[in-house]
Interface confidence: low
């Protein structure tokens, strides 16, 4: 019996399959090369092509940049000759790997170019507040496609001590549940660290002036963040979920978290920032529903309901 050549094991034809691709979201900084990855298997050998924003994109035909394209691969790297070249290449990319049995398609790869971060110049007025009252010192860092780290320091580069009373929110603002005369400083400085560009920038110092009073008035809790009674969030399966509640009041409120539909998934939940932040690791379908924070002190309570919808990543 003669077996035709194409049926021998090593000659079996295979349609293309994408084996490696860039993440769906890619942030590049001014000094970075742009590398987009697309690898595929298939027999006969696959041919690659790219689209950007739905239009055929040929990396090697781009002017003013150096392109390295791997042989037998769809991956390529673009190196620019100026500090702003990455802006040109922002868009949604897709890789197609084809042979005569068909075409495989990568997911959409959103390439975002991050400019050099700058804080807009502003005149910062002193913040005046009576002892016992609450106050929020804004940070408002420049927008960034990549997560950045925020620090509050004084002019001696010492971190501002945080506790149940003083806390920095996920948004970078510094929240005081109630102020003491010891908070009186002229140099509250918000620092933003952009890991991608290895850049640290700082905001103009804020002068916090606390007026002493003879008697601090007790106040029941009120949420400084979020300010409304409920909010809706979409969480992606497999991703972490971070919920936050920051309250003001005197005495300093404590924060509790609960899940009205039953217990929290204790094995995957961590509480941070003196209980003001709830982090749920690796969200699953069963985490869908309502999460509630409660701020309490001896005078009363305030609460916020987070309605979380879990969607496939």
């Amino acid at each position: 019996i003669q077996i035709p050549e194409e049926y021998e094991g090593h000659h079996v034809m295979e349609p293309p399959v994408i084996t490696e691709q860039s993440p769906r979201r890619l942030v590049v900084f001014p000094t970075d090369d742009i590398s987009l990855k697309c690898e595929a298997s298939g027999k006969p050998e696959v041919q690659f092509r790219w689209t950007r924003d739905g239009v055929h994109f040929k990396p090697k035909e781009e002017l003013g940049v150096t392109v390295y394209q791997s042989p037998h691969s769809g991956s390529f790297t673009i190196t620019g000759n100026n500090s702003n070249f990455a802006q040109r290449f922002q868009g949604i990319y897709r890789c197609f790997a084809s042979n005569k049995l068909g075409t495989a398609m990568s997911h959409e790869i959103r390439l975002m170019a991050e400019g050099a971060p700058k804080w807009p110049k502003e005149t910062v007025k002193p913040v005046e507040v009576e002892e016992g009252e609450s106050v929020v010192l804004p940070c408002n860092p420049p927008p960034s496609a990549e997560p950045l780290r925020i620090y509050w320091m004084n002019s001696k580069i010492l971190h501002i001590k945080q506790d149940e009373r003083v806390t920095m929110g996920q948004n970078g603002n510094l929240y005081f549940a109630n102020v003491l005369t010891s908070d009186n400083h002229s140099d509250y400085i918000c620092h933003a660290h952009f890991p991608g560009t290895r850049t640290i920038i700082q905001k103009e110092p804020i002068d916090l002036r606390v007026k002493a009073t003879n008697s601090m008035i007790d106040r029941k809790p009120r949420l400084l963040f979020p300010t409304n009674s409920s909010s809706h969030l979409v969480a992606l399966q497999g991703q972490p979920l971070v919920l936050e509640c920051i309250a003001e009041g005197f005495p300093t409120p404590t924060i509790k978290w609960l899940r009205p539909s039953g217990p929290m998934p204790a094995d995957r939940v961590t509480y941070q920032n003196h209980n003001k932040t709830l982090q749920l690791l690796k969200v699953g379908e069963e985490d869908d529903g309502e999460y509630r924070c409660l701020a309490e002190n001896s005078l009363g309570s305030a609460r916020h309901a987070y309605y979380v919808t879990v969607e496939a990543a």
């Epitope: 009674s229 809706h232 509790k256 609960l258 009205p260 039953g262 529903g289 609460r303 309901a305 309605y307």
Partner: antibody, heavy 118, light 113 residues
Framework: QVQLVQPGDELVKPGASVKLSCKAS????????MQWVKQRPGQGLEWIGE????????NYNEMFKSKAVLSVDKSVSTAYMQLSSLTAEDTAVYYC???????????WGQGTLVTVSS | DIVMTQSPDSLAVSLGERVTMNCKSS????????????LAWYQQKPGQPPKLLIY???TRESGVPDRFSGSGSGTDFTLTISSLQAEDVALYYC?????????FGQGTKLEIK
């Protein structure tokens, strides 16, 4: 203040359906789950299910899954419960109640008495 | 489902006397992360809807007289009325809100002797 207003009595024939309403006021309707509870004459309380008015999400007691359907109309801050294929066993007072996850069921409607009789 | 069992089914107590009634759950209602017991007590008078008395097993709802108190943890809970008043005649239900479906006890009927 918080109020949950339910209509009075309903007399329905066996095999028929009835849609009960619960009109909410005095709070943000979409912020809290609405509960429904059954109480047969001279008997205890049974939890039927709940609905989240903000997104229509429901949780049912398995015992009532084929009996009750919960819904809301956010525009009029009203929750509804439709009961189908009624029998004498469904004769009961049906309460809506507000459950905000912290204080258990802290506000209740006055209840609607559903009488199933031919 | 979590089964809630109340005892006794009924009791008669003289005015001014101390009243205790019990509620047992088929599984623990204590959530270790927040050390809360997901149990509530309700009072129901004839022709009226239930009224919340106690939540988290021991926290009195605002406006509830301080003669009412709740205690217990895990699976065994108690509602105590320190000095019975005429207006306390009613049915008392415990309810768990730990797991779906939420379930009530069968009730304890309190009367005056």
């Amino acid at each position: 203040q918080v109020q949950l207003v339910q209509p009075g009595d309903e007399l329905v024939k066996p095999g028929a359906s009835v849609k009960l309403s619960c009109k909410a006021s005095g709070y943000t309707f979409t912020s809290y789950w609405m509960q429904w509870v059954k109480q047969r004459p001279g008997q205890g309380l049974e939890w039927i299910g709940e609905i989240n008015p903000s997104n229509g999400r429901t949780n049912y007691n398995e015992m009532f899954k084929s009996k009750a359907v919960l819904s809301v109309d956010k525009s009029v801050s009203t929750a509804y419960m439709q009961l189908s294929s009624l029998t004498a066993e469904d004769t009961a007072v049906y309460y809506c109640a507000l459950y905000d996850g912290y204080y258990a069921m802290d506000y209740w409607g006055q209840g609607t008495l559903v009488t199933v009789s031919s | 489902d979590i089964v809630m069992t109340q005892s006794p089914d009924s009791l008669a107590v003289s005015l001014g006397e101390r009243v205790t009634m019990n509620c047992k759950s088929s599984q623990s209602l204590l959530y270790s992360s927040n050390q809360k017991n997901y149990l509530a007590w309700y009072q129901q008078k004839p022709g009226q809807p239930p009224k919340l008395l106690i939540y988290w097993a021991s926290t009195r709802e605002s406006g509830v007289p301080d003669r009412f108190s709740g205690s217990g943890s895990g699976t065994d809970f108690t509602l105590t009325i320190s000095s019975l008043q005429a207006e306390d005649v009613a049915l008392y239900y415990c309810q768990q809100y730990h797991s779906y479906p939420f379930t009530f006890g069968q009730g304890t009927k309190l009367e005056i002797k």
